[in-house]
Interface confidence: medium
Amino acid sequence: EVEKTACPSGKKAREIDESLIFYKKWELEACVDAALLATQMDRVNAIPFTYEQLDVLKHKLDELYPQGYPESVIQHLGYLFLKMSPEDIRKWNVTSLETLKALLEVNKGHEMSPQVATLIDRFVKGRGQLDKDTLDTLTAFYPGYLCSLSPEELSSVPPSSIWAVRPQDLDTCDPRQLDVLYPKARLAFQNMNGSEYFVKIQSFLGGAPTEDLKALSQQNVSMDLATFMKLRTDAVLPLTVAEVQKLLGPHVEGLKAEERHRPVRDWILRQRQDDLDTLGLGLQG
């Protein structure tokens, strides 16, 4: 056992190359210098190491950097990132978007792991806010990322970042999250003309107040039923039959199919029957 701790003659690694795949775990431990590994991390991903061998390489880096890896090493971790625990990642200070992209690429196509969540959290906290480039990157890898944030975390998103948000990024957001995002979107898109503004703001309307819906009803926007059904119930209730008719335009006929569902059912109840009759849809208040 004692002999195994020493590197056999002629086996000392001069560089990180393919010959190392034939090393046993104990040989890697004894023969690969941690400092050499750190400077040549970019080569590790080109070599088909086994999971056990990667464990050894990680152990060597952990010994060299007990306080956490420097960004120069982190950027080139590649598949070794999958071996990291959230506790390891909490020690890191990741400031470069390129580093973040490189690590997200390793996990691409998979659910957001605890490691990735910790990495993103460290990165965003380091930056102080969720800027547009970061948001663009994160939503490209994880379309549901925005909706995984708490309303409190979303409050740090600057309005300028909203330009990076696509409709599918908001698919899983709940009403409280949209309450935070809507005013930011309204601010971000305020200088756009009517039809272009509606295209951009549409996905955020689940956070819109009544007065904004009333304003939209005057702009011939032809809101589809899917968007209408996601509006806040308390924002829809005060709308008149005429305002809903203008808001939905030709889609108003879809109210009949949704009459048992919120917010339509609540809205119908609060309308006068003779007003509902003007729609000619047979809606019963």
Epitope: R176, M229, D234, H261, R262, G285
Partner: antibody, heavy 119, light 107 residues
Amino acid sequence: QVQLQESGPGLVKPSETLSLTCTVSGGSVSSYHDLWSWIRQPPGKGLEWIGYIYYSGSTNYNPSLKSRVTISVDTSKNQFSLKLSSVTAADTAVYYCAREGKNGAFDIWGQGTMVTVSS
Amino acid sequence: DIQMTQSPSSLSASVGDRVTITCRASQSISSYLNWYQQKPGKAPKLLIYAASSLQSGVPSRFSGSGSGTDFTLTISSLQPEDFATYYCQQSYSTPLTFGGGTKVEIK
């Protein structure tokens, strides 16, 4: 603090009509956001929504009971009522009145009243 | 009608345990999902509304999550007063419907 109180007979004969009233105190049955529901729970079983009413008189009933149910509101007395006709033993339950607030949930309930259908 | 399926129907747990109850809707109900607690001989009490919002006065050990068809009620550290039956309820579509209930008993 809004409170609800059910009242009505605890025993009803089969084929007769069950009548219950819910009195709203500490608030108004005419509140813009609120819907007023009746819900029942047979002994040892789960909860079943019967229907609701808005202060304007608009109603919505559970289709499984619709042919036998009438819910009405009396804004002057701050009350709403339930009538269930042609009752059978299967209608034996604790009957609750409840408020569906603007958060879309039953946030206030009466204490419930047990109604037994038996001859 | 939208069917609400709760699981498990009953569970045994100890004080201090983390307890999770799930509720599945037969079709998407967005976030229109509420959770109630009921003790024997008492009316149900609202715990969580709109899937994840804590009702005023309810202890923070209760939390809700989910959207669409799958929802969860979590009690982070079970207290003696939490032994009761829990119901989920959808308020998206009439008829309003409840889950069958989950009875949380002392182990």
